[in-house]
Structures are given as structure tokens and as C-alpha cells.
């Protein structure tokens, strides 16, 4: 169970694959696409709001927590929309919903090598967000050796060192990068 209903912290970050392709979102009221693609040189990277929650460490899960606790995250590309795991379809979807969020929106955060992370479904341990055919999908990882397989590894980073922000009032934040410094406190996220 998740301890408390409020996140312990929130960060705004770009999400890219192990091979440095960007995760991008094209979102309308009634439809969306999630792409894994190389961006143009002048194109800004999409950001996701990562909300970190502390959870009790269940015995059948292997999160990177301490003292019997682990970190879970939700990922939001814009206000009121969150990534969801659809375990039946093995797909990663965007859903508009209100809090409290369903379990399908929570992912156990694993800190991996080379400043990479992976996202394990709270609702289906052993199943991770991964990349398949230039789209996000749910990928079953059979053994701990496969936890380092490249297609489930992601980077929360940017070339701009001031890109990761600790979010203040993130739910109302929709402005551009130029104004970000005035809305956020710079915060380094250590893996």
C-alpha cells in the first residue's frame, strides 16, 4: 500500500530511452499518441511530471527502497493525464483521471546502471514499461539478469543541467522553459 496520498516530491524531467531517443506525446481531448523517436536539433523535449510516493515494501516485489520501503512514481505529461499500465493489452496508455489515481498509474522505480531507471507495474510485478516497435509497451522480465535489458531502461536527464526541477505548484505549471527558473527550485536528482 502507498503510504499517504500525497507525493513526497515531484520532478519535471524529460524521458528518453537507453539509446537516447525521446518519449514524446501528441495529446488531444479524445485521442493521443505516444512516440519513441529522434528529435530535431532545435526541438524541445517533452517533459513528464514524476510524482514520487513512498510505499511499504511487499515481499513479492523488488523495488529499490530502504528500510522496507520503496519508491513508486506516477508519470504525467500534462495536467490531469497520467500514464497507465494496461496489463491485458500489454500496452502503455494515457488516461485522463482525477485523484486518487488507480493502481495502474503507479510504477515501482528501479535505479539501474548508467544513470538509468526502469518502471515496474505496481499491478503486475515483473512487468515493466519498455520500448517495442518505436512505441511504449509493457514487457515481461523473467529473471533479474534481464532487468538490465536495454529496452526497459530509461534516462531522466537532459543536456541542460538546469532541466530537472523540483516542482512548486506543478499542477498549474504550463509555461515555457524560459520562465521555468522563476517557477521552480533547481534540484539535482541523484541515482
Amino acid at each position: 500500500s502507498i503510504t499517504g496520498i500525497s507525493p513526497i516530491t515531484e520532478y519535471l524531467a524529460s524521458l528518453s530511452t537507453y539509446n537516447d531517443q525521446s518519449i514524446t506525446f501528441a495529446l488531444e481531448d479524445e485521442s493521443y499518441e505516444i512516440y519513441v523517436e529522434d528529435l530535431k536539433k532545435d526541438e524541445k523535449k517533452d517533459k513528464v511530471l514524476l510524482s514520487y510516493y513512498e510505499s511499504q515494501h511487499p515481499s513479492n516485489e523488488s523495488g529499490d527502497g530502504v528500510d522496507g520501503k520503496m519508491l513508486m512514481v506516477t508519470l504525467s505529461p500534462t495536467k490531469d493525464f497520467w500514464l497507465h499500465a494496461n496489463n491485458k493489452e500489454h500496452s502503455v496508455e494515457l488516461h485522463k483521471c482525477e485523484k486518487p489515481l488507480p493502481d495502474q498509474a503507479f510504477f515501482v522505480l528501479h535505479n539501474m546502471h548508467s544513470n538509468c531507471v526502469s518502471f515496474e507495474c505496481k499491478t503486475d510485478p515483473g512487468v515493466f514499461i519498455g520500448v517495442k516497435d518505436n512505441h511504449l509497451a509493457l514487457i515481461k522480465v523473467d529473471s533479474s539478469e534481464n532487468l538490465c535489458t536495454e529496452n526497459i531502461l530509461f534516462k531522466l536527464s537532459e543536456t541542460n543541467p538546469a532541466f530537472l526541477y523540483k516542482v512548486v505548484g506543478a499542477a498549474d505549471y504550463k509555461d515555457d522553459d524560459d520562465k521555468a527558473a522563476h517557477h521552480h527550485h533547481h534540484h539535482h536528482h541523484h541515482h
Epitope: 506525446f25 488531444e28 481531448d29 530535431k40 536539433k41 526541438e43 504550463k174 509555461d175 520562465k179
Partner: antibody, heavy 126, light 106 residues
Framework: EVQLLESGGGLVQPGGSLRLSCAAS????????MSWVRQAPGKGLEWVSA????????YYADSVKGRFTISRDNSKNTLYLQMNSLRAEDTAVYYC????????WGGGLRYPFGYWGQGTMVTVSS | LPVLTQPPSVSVSPGQKASITCSGE??????AAWYQQKPGQSPILVIY???KRPSGIPERFSGSNSGNTATLTISGTQDMDEADYYC?????????FGGGTKVTVL
């Protein structure tokens, strides 16, 4: 169905003011950045101004900076353009346009104009 | 800001291919969009992100963008494609349009 309906155009003398409105329907207005684009008679398209979904960020072409003010009322699903110190060269059809996609966190301006209104004519002449 | 240069006019016979160029410094580093405007009507988005077509836009419309030139191609041009076409990019949160190209179907 997405609909954008401009109003407020008309004839105004040089140095005068005009306020354009764009009533939006058929989508979640506050989620999208909006722009004003104008077209002088027989000429091409010129981007004028834009505003983020929340209204917290505004952007202007150099040709109107300091004279025009873009704003929005998300409770009324309406976009505005306050035009002051009007000049003859501001004569044009003014279109409001919606971004193709919902603005993301820290999005700035980068999406194409997916939907356009029918335009309202502004004539600046003495 | 980049200046986007388009040919003022392009003529094409029905069923033939029409290519409209849009030139600007480092054009290939940005995403280009293309709009179609018929007389007395509002513009319509026909290509975005260089190559993608919005729903409802016929497959005969395609786009490319590299180097300093973006190109809109209409293959198998029809009479209904006669219109003005404008390219557009964003540069530092400023919208920039090309001067427009009038496509005439002979």
C-alpha cells in the same frame, strides 16, 4: 466538433483601439495554447501573438509588441486581442487558431495550428 | 528569425506532381508545417512535423525537410488542390510563415 468564432472587427481610425474576441467550443479550452494570425488583403499569413493554456505566458511578433495584448478567459472559453495605437499596416483579416495538441508541461510554442476560425476583418483608415 | 522563402507560383497539369519548396537557414533542424488556403476561406493544416498528415488530408499530400529546404509534394494533383500554400515553423517561441505559393492547376 472544434469551433472558433472571431468577432470585434471593424473600421477604426489610425491611433485607435479595437478588441477582438474568439469564442471557442468543442474542446477543453484551457488545455491548449492559442494564437492570433493575420492576413493583409492580397498578402500572406503573419503570426501575431500567442498565449499558453493557463494564460501565464504570452508571446508577440515584433511588429505588434507594446501595442497589442493577448489574453484569455478560460471560464468563458474566450480568447482576446486588445489592439491599441492601430496603424494602416494592421489592416487585415485576423484569425484565431488553436494548437493541434494539448500543451504539455513547460511546452512553450511548438505545435502547428490545427484549427482556425473564419476570421474577422480589421480596417485601419482615416 | 529565419526568413522562409517560397516560390510565388507553381503551375501543374491535373494528375501530375507539384512540388513547393520552403527555404530557410537550418530549416532541417526545425519541424515544418504546411497550410492550404483557398480563396475566401481559412487556412487548413495539411502537413505537420515535416511529413505527417492530419486525419482527413488525402495521401497525395506529402512532405520532407532536410538541409535548408522543406518541400510539400502533391502527387496526382487534382483541380481541388488549386490554392495558396504556406510553410510555417516556430523559432524561439515566435511563429514564422513563408510568403506563400499559389498553385495553379492548368
Amino acid at each position: 466538433e472544434v469551433q472558433l468564432l472571431e468577432s470585434g472587427g471593424g473600421l477604426v481610425q489610425p491611433g485607435g483601439s479595437l478588441r477582438l474576441s474568439c469564442a471557442a467550443s468543442g474542446f477543453t479550452f484551457s488545455s491548449y495554447a492559442m494564437s492570433w494570425v493575420r492576413q493583409a488583403p492580397g498578402k500572406g499569413l503573419e503570426w501575431v501573438s500567442a498565449i499558453s493554456g493557463s494564460g501565464g505566458s504570452t508571446y508577440y511578433a515584433d511588429s505588434v509588441k507594446g501595442r497589442f495584448t493577448i489574453s484569455r478567459d478560460n471560464s468563458k472559453n474566450t480568447l482576446y486581442l486588445q489592439m491599441n495605437s492601430l496603424r494602416a499596416e494592421d489592416t487585415a483579416v485576423y484569425y484565431c487558431a488553436r494548437d493541434l495538441w494539448i500543451q504539455l508541461w513547460g511546452g512553450g510554442l511548438r505545435y502547428p495550428f490545427g484549427y482556425w476560425g473564419q476570421g474577422t476583418m480589421v480596417t485601419v483608415s482615416s | 528569425l529565419p526568413v522562409l522563402t517560397q516560390p510565388p507560383s507553381v503551375s501543374v497539369s491535373p494528375g501530375q506532381k507539384a512540388s513547393i519548396t520552403c527555404s530557410g537557414e537550418r530549416m532541417g533542424d526545425k519541424y515544418a508545417a504546411w497550410y492550404q488556403q483557398k480563396p475566401g476561406q481559412s487556412p487548413i493544416l495539411v502537413i505537420y512535423q515535416d511529413t505527417k498528415r492530419p486525419s482527413g488530408i488525402p495521401e497525395r499530400f506529402s512532405g520532407s525537410n532536410s538541409g535548408n529546404t522543406a518541400t510539400l509534394t502533391i502527387s496526382g494533383t487534382q483541380d481541388m488542390d488549386e490554392a495558396d500554400y504556406y510553410c510555417q515553423v516556430w523559432d524561439s517561441s515566435t511563429g514564422v510563415f513563408g510568403g506563400g505559393t499559389k498553385v495553379t492547376v492548368l
